[in-house]
């Protein structure tokens, strides 16, 4: 995402529409207080950074209000008035979606549907990855809404689930992020378990954008 | 289907001021921002900006503030181009565009995928 | 701002053979690239966009690559319509376009 400019990586994420975070990574300034200096139109006065992160007591990015906004961030890391970086993205890009809520199982035989909150904007996958403890891999299927039907269940395995959002690559490009996962929760006989028991860890998730 | 036409030709002398209007039918007006680009004969494109049409909250590139406004009139889903103190460098061809892909935000996002057919303004003393 | 350069100014190719344009972006744009042909007297029409991703009715002779900072636009076999200016655009920040490649038929 960021090309280095004197030394300095950085990271955007503008999670669910409403957050931009910006994040550095500047090893020359590891002990250094750099400022985040943004403005959303290119003929305005920068503003600066009120609400900074920090990591071992110095400043590492910025979070930024940007409720539904499609703008171009313009922004410049200082030290002092030397700017070490200076960049323009447009945020819509870096989307990262909100993980999902609600999410609710109806099972009918050897199927069930996920539903969950479709959030308020579209150009999304809703994925739904599954297994039981037969499994060597999660299974995955996505729709564009969350309501999600996966067919050919054994009754009488456990199962867990785990559901996440996605940005559709075609629309937003490569540079996107996948929510967070749902918690995980396990079903057997169409009845919520508290685990399947007969896998004391489940192996990590396809992590396939 | 979509479809944005631009008003016609103009000819204005130094000094003066000229209105360009984009008409857009075929999608809800206020679900894409218009964004304004310019072509002077015989050379590249260059973005001016773009508007909000939720909002109609201009946004400028650098290099066309001050005399180039961007405007909304919702009601008749049209987005207008005004240049004031007009001057021979600004004789160009005029094109609104729209993005074609992101239907999350009212935005510009840079890939215009529908566009006007173009208005030629002459600047001539 | 983001430079954008083509080369060349200008091809001349015979029909059925392989047209290879070329951008420079003066910085990285990952993936933020799109192509566009524009005939005279027209406005530009979007080919590519994400720099390899084929816009829906785009005939599949058209193909992109690249990212970063260099990129390609592919002709597989040129045909007498596909004669326009081809213009590589950015998005990564607030778009800009290449100076165009002008494409003819010997």
């Known amino acids: 995402q960021g090309g280095a400019a004197e030394g300095v990586q950085i990271q955007i994420i503008y999670f669910n529409l409403e957050t931009v975070q910006v994040t550095w990574n500047a090893s020359k300034y590891s002990r250094t207080n750099l400022t985040f200096h943004y403005r959303f139109n290119g003929d305005e006065a920068y503003d600066q950074c009120t609400n900074y992160l920090l990591q071992e007591g110095h400043t590492s990015g910025c979070l930024l209000d940007a409720e539904q906004r499609d703008d171009i961030l313009y922004f410049s890391i200082r030290n002092g008035t030397h700017p070490v970086f200076t960049a323009s993205r447009w945020m819509v890009y870096y989307l990262k979606p909100s993980s999902p809520k609600h999410v609710r199982f109806s099972w009918h035989q050897d199927a069930v549907t996920v539903t969950c909150s479709d959030l308020s904007y579209g150009d999304l996958l809703y994925e739904v990855q599954y297994r039981s403890p037969f499994d060597t891999e999660w299974q995955s299927k996505q729709e564009n809404t969350c309501n999600v039907t996966i067919e050919g269940l054994d009754a009488e395995k456990c199962y867990s689930f785990w559901v996440r959002v996605k940005a559709m690559e075609d629309v937003y490009g490569p540079d996107t992020y996948p929510s967070d996962w749902s918690e995980v929760t396990c079903w057997q006989r169409g009845e919520i378990r508290d685990a399947c028991a007969e896998t004391p860890t489940p192996p990590k998730p396809k992590l396939s954008k | 289907q979509v479809q944005l036409v631009q008003s016609g030709a103009e000819v204005k002398k130094p000094g003066a001021s000229v209105k360009v209007s984009c008409k857009a039918s075929g999608y809800t007006f206020t679900t894409y921002g218009i964004s304004w680009l310019r072509q002077a004969p015989g050379q590249g494109l260059e973005w001016m900006g773009w508007v909000n049409t939720n909002t109609g909250n201009p946004r400028y590139a650098q290099g066309f503030t001050g005399r180039f406004v961007f405007s909304l009139d919702t009601s008749v889903s049209t987005a207008y181009l005004q240049i004031s103190s007009l001057k021979a460098e600004d004789t160009a061809v005029y094109y609104c565009a729209r993005e074609g892909f992101i239907t999350t935000v009212v935005g510009a996002a840079g890939r215009f995928v529908y566009w006007g057919q173009g208005t030629l303004v002459t600047v001539s003393s | 701002e983001i430079v954008m350069t083509q080369s060349p100014a200008t091809l001349s190719l015979s029909p059925g053979e392989r047209a290879t344009l070329s951008c420079r972006a003066s910085?990285?744009?990952?993936?933020?690239l799109a192509w566009y042909q524009q005939k005279p007297g027209q406005p530009p029409k979007l080919l590519i966009h994400?720099?390899?991703t084929r816009v829906s009715g785009v005939p599949d002779r058209f193909s992109g690559s690249g990212s970063g900072t260099d990129f390609t636009l592919t002709i597989s076999s040129l045909q007498a319509e596909d004669v326009a200016v081809y213009y590589c655009?950015?998005?990564?920040?607030?778009?800009?376009f290449g100076q165009g490649t002008k494409l003819e038929i010997k």
């Open positions: 655009q950015q998005y990564s920040t607030y778009p800009t």
């Open positions: 910085q990285s744009v990952s993936s933020s």
């Open positions: 994400w720099a390899v």
